[in-house]
């Protein structure tokens, strides 16, 4: 009997497994079978993933077909798109790889279609009836981590037998997903059973360190240990590591716990986890995650500045009102003729040459949510009209030359009416407005600060914010603040708090996916986290009412209400899709930008300073709201709805906006 038709088999990498089940099933049956095992039908979106599928499927018979996780509803064909209107069963249409057997041909697409992969040759994609029971199906299983296959030991009776959480049993795995069991039989009789588990210090590893079979102790080859070998009373040997190192998952080698850069800023070996994290001056450990560092808002410390204070990532600055100048201590103000003096308390300056790379500084720029803070006793907003602030644009920097020092970046809201509430807060929270410019002009120099025209409320003569001069002789150009041009509109009505709670668009490299919102509001520090949906679990879909604002989990109530800005469509980067052409299978083609459909209207959320390069969820980049296939009934077009106050799912790096959110559930996606 042909091995292809025998037992299921799989191929695993460090974060996912593909498994081939040679069982005759319809698409729906196959989808259910994968889901029941905790996976999904395979979604090979990249050439690398496709290569793993190719290796797994091998050279099967031409007559055999395997379901993959692509389905299209009736009358949903979009032949100009890489996926031709098909949607992954994970709920989106993002792909960097296609392998259609034939070029797209025009047609009305009257019926629901599903995709099967040929078991032979180039493993081309064919579309056909979803109700056909084809020869098998490919499942994909994502997980939090994997354990490396165990090294064979001298005393073993045979290779380790592994059982995965999705019930595949084999000796051939290179990686074993979290939850797998390894059974080792020893020549001396009793064997050992190990579990791939989460380690206390993070990551996953085998539940027991080797060697597993009784051997000749430490004498031959130091018992297989990299550092120290210890012979236990029961005859087993165990490995230990010298100070500053910890035992690796294989139970033999030793690793520097700081080598994987577990800390955002500074890492020291030692401590209960094998390492401890420290933050630089001007930062403190995040309460929810001690590996991360958050800016210390020095402006919240009473008396840090005599008059006005601006906080930015890693430091703060004191300012004096017009007619006063900052004293040498950088804190006090004294009457003087000179205007606009400023002292920069950049707490990170002295650390710039301590081996830190540029990235921290770039991230600080990206993450800056600088807040103007008035010190007690200075009422600098008089009862006038609500401020009418106009924001120009956030400059675009060439990818390799972003500014290396964070500027103080006081930003002002767009012309929105502030709600009429009594003015209590001494903190003006400043975040980034959702003003998305499709074309952001590039500044000639990466170090030139942004020009931010703004209109300020009128201030009494002795309490006006100084016009900040473009150049400070005492500061190098990289440290210079943004230029603010100021004019004075009419007086606002009494008891209007300053409405400064808006967002800036971020600068994304061509194919970098924006993060889910991670919004920091100075002062009240409201953080909105949209958690990544874990793979292979149908998440709860919360539908926001048309005018209901999104709720920030566990967030303190803001003392000022922010009006939601309209959703602005954004230009998406062109999608480069790698495609195996039917004529020349290895050929990779680029889909030109012109062929891309317009993206869904999308909010570009602020990037978290610690995860700027991670698309949506670093562990499971393709985890979306899963679409559940069904095989009956007519197929109306997918209706999209965009509630006025609900953030959309972030578009992915490849430019096709995810349908995971805001899909009015179609009857045929159960």
């Amino acid at each position: 009997q042909d091995p292809w038709a025998a037992e299921p088999r799989s191929a695993c990498g460090p974060s996912s497994c593909y498994a081939l089940f040679p069982r005759r099933r319809t698409f729906l049956e196959a989808w259910r079978a994968c889901r029941e095992l905790g996976g999904d039908l395979a979604t090979p979106r990249t050439p690398e993933e496709a290569q793993r599928v190719d290796n797994l499927v091998g050279a099967g018979p031409a007559s055999r077909l395997l379901w993959i996780g692509l389905q299209r509803q009736a009358r949903q064909c979009q032949l100009q798109r890489p996926l031709r209107g098909f949607t992954w069963t994970t709920g989106d249409q993002d792909t960097a790889f296609t392998n259609w057997a034939q070029p797209a041909t025009g047609g009305p697409c009257p019926a629901q279609r599903c995709v099967a992969l040929e078991a032979s040759g180039e493993h081309r994609w064919l579309e056909g009836s979803c109700t056909l029971a084809v020869d098998g199906y490919l499942c994909q299983f994502g997980f939090e981590g994997a354990c490396p296959a165990l090294q064979d030991e001298a005393g073993q009776a045979g290779p380790a037998v592994y059982t995965t959480p999705f019930h595949l049993v084999s000796t051939e795995f290179e990686w074993l997903p979290f939850g797998s069991v390894a059974a080792v039989q020893c020549q001396a009789g009793r064997g050992a059973s190990l579990l791939c588990v989460k380690q206390p210090e993070g990551g996953v590893g085998w539940s027991r360190a080797g060697p597993l079979c009784l051997g000749a102790g430490c004498s031959p080859d130091n018992g297989g240990c990299e550092h120290e070998c210890v012979e236990e009373v029961d005859g087993h040997v165990s490995c230990r590591c010298t100070e500053g190192f910890r035992l690796a998952a294989d139970g033999r080698s030793c690793e520097d716990p700081c080598a994987q850069a577990p800390c955002e800023q500074q890492c020291e070996p030692g401590g209960p986890q094998g390492y401890s994290c420290h933050c630089r001056l001007g930062f403190r450990p995040a309460e929810d995650d001690p590996h991360r560092c958050v800016d210390t808002d020095e402006c919240q410390i009473a008396g840090v500045c005599q008059q006005m204070c601006v906080n930015y990532v890693g430091g703060f600055e004191c300012y004096c009102s017009e007619g006063h100048e900052l004293e040498a201590d950088g804190i006090s103000c004294s009457p003087a003729g000179a205007m606009g003096a400023r002292a920069s308390q950049d707490l990170g300056d002295e650390l710039l040459d301590d081996g830190e790379d540029e990235e921290d500084e770039d991230e600080a720029w990206e993450a800056f949510g600088g807040g103007w803070t008035e010190m007690p006793g200075i009422l600098w907003m008089e009862p006038t009209q609500p401020p009418d602030f106009a924001l120009a644009y956030r400059p675009s920097f060439p990818e390799d030359r972003e500014p290396q020092i964070p500027y103080p970046e006081p930003t002002w809201p767009p012309p929105l009416s502030a709600p009429r509430v009594p003015y209590h807060s001494s903190v003006l929270s400043v975040t980034r407005p959702v003003v998305v410019s499709a074309t952001r002009p590039t500044l000639p120099s990466a170090h030139q600060p942004p020009v931010i025209p703004a209109t300020h409320p009128a201030l009494s003569r002795d309490h006006q914010i100084p016009v900040i001069a473009a150049n400070y002789p005492d500061l190098p150009s990289a440290y210079q603040p943004g230029i603010l041009s100021v004019s004075h509109p009419a007086q606002p009505p009494a008891h209007q708090p300053p409405m400064i709670s808006t967002r800036y668009p971020e600068l994304f490299p061509a194919h970098q996916s924006p993060m889910f919102p991670d919004t920091q509001v100075a002062g009240t520090q409201t953080t909105t986290h949209l958690p990544a949906i874990p793979p292979n679990r149908a998440p709860l879909v919360t539908t926001l009412g048309a005018h209901q604002p999104p709720q920030a989990p566990d967030a303190p109530v803001l003392r000022t209400q922010a009006t939601q800005l309209p959703i602005i469509p954004t230009a998406q980067p062109s999608l480069t899709t790698s495609s195996r052409s039917p004529v020349s299978p290895a050929h990779q083609v680029s889909v030109p930008a012109a062929t891309q459909p317009p993206a869904l209207p999308t909010l570009l959320p602020s990037q978290s300073p610690t995860n700027q390069t991670s698309p949506i969820s670093p562990t499971h980049p393709h985890s979306k709201v899963p679409q559940i296939p069904r095989e009956d009934g007519p197929s109306p077009k997918l209706a999209l709805w965009l509630p006025s106050a609900a953030p959309t799912a972030a578009p992915t790096a490849l430019g096709e906006a995810s349908l995971a959110e805001h899909i009015q559930r179609d009857d045929r996606w159960l």
Epitope: W4, A5, R113
Partner: antibody, heavy 124, light 108 residues
Framework: QVQLVQSGAEVKKPGASVKLSCKAS????????IHWVRQTPGQRLEWMGY????????TYNQKFKGRVTITGDTSANTAYMELNSLTSEDTAVYYC?????????????????WGQGTLVTVSS | DIQLTQSPSFLSASVGDRVTITCRAS??????VAWYQQKPGKAPKLLIY???NRYTGVPSRFSGSGSGTEFTLTISSLQSEDLATYYC??????????FGQGTKLEIK
């Protein structure tokens, strides 16, 4: 071009067996499944079973279970169908047909090529 | 087993007529339906696969439609060479194929 050529007509007595052949040409024999279908005098078409010559995988219609055996000879590019315990009800034209794999980027399990048919008459 | 019922069983039409043959399935078969033409004394020939896709070399006057339980074969302008018996076939529970009883088309 693709061709399926079947063996000649057979006359059998009730209780006997018949073995029909279907020689394939014009394509790679192991790449396609061969089905057997019969057509009774009342013109009804009835599926009997298939063989995948790649691995000799076979499946039969329950109605014929135990009476029908389909085999293949890859060296001769030929499929065979043997029907035992014949009765007059088995009088029919027997066709072999190739199951298509894909047409113009579609996968489909319809039968794209048929043999010319073999008439089997069961009579005492 | 899935039953297929064709209607009409017999049809007489003139050259140039638009002819429609219907096939009803006893349960949902998606689009796993094919249509065959069988001329007297010959083997069946594939016309339409996957409910609506015309097979290579089949004249454009033949078209198929439908999904689920109701399927239609249409000959837009009948020609004299279209005299034949037409069969629908389902294969949704492959490999268990079932066929309709056939529609005999006669030219007036």
């Amino acid at each position: 071009q693709v061709q399926l050529v079947q063996s000649g007509a057979e006359v059998k007595k009730p209780g006997a067996s018949v073995k029909l052949s279907c020689k394939a040409s014009g394509y790679t024999f192991t790449d396609y499944v061969i089905h057997w279908v019969r057509q009774t005098p009342g013109q009804r078409l009835e599926w009997m079973g298939y063989i995948n010559p790649y691995d000799d995988d076979t499946t039969y219609n329950q109605k014929f279970k135990g009476r029908v055996t389909i085999t293949g000879d890859t060296s001769a590019n030929t499929a065979y169908m043997e029907l035992n315990s014949l009765t007059s009800e088995d009088t029919a034209v027997y066709y072999c047909a190739r199951r298509g794999n894909s047409y113009d980027g579609y996968f489909d399990y319809s039968m794209d090529y048929w043999g010319q048919g073999t008439l089997v008459t069961v009579s005492s | 087993d899935i039953q297929l019922t064709q209607s009409p069983s017999f049809l007489s039409a003139s050259v140039g007529d638009r002819v429609t043959i219907t096939c009803r399935a006893s349960q949902n078969v998606g689009t796993a339906v094919a249509w065959y033409q069988q001329k007297p004394g010959k083997a069946p020939k594939l016309l339409i696969y996957s409910a609506s896709n015309r097979y290579t070399g089949v004249p454009s006057r033949f078209s198929g439609s439908g999904s689920g339980t109701e399927f239609t074969l249409t000959i837009s302008s009948l020609q004299s060479e279209d005299l034949a018996t037409y069969y629908c076939q389902q294969y949704t529970n492959y490999p268990m194929y079932t066929f309709g009883q056939g529609t005999k088309l006669e030219i007036k």
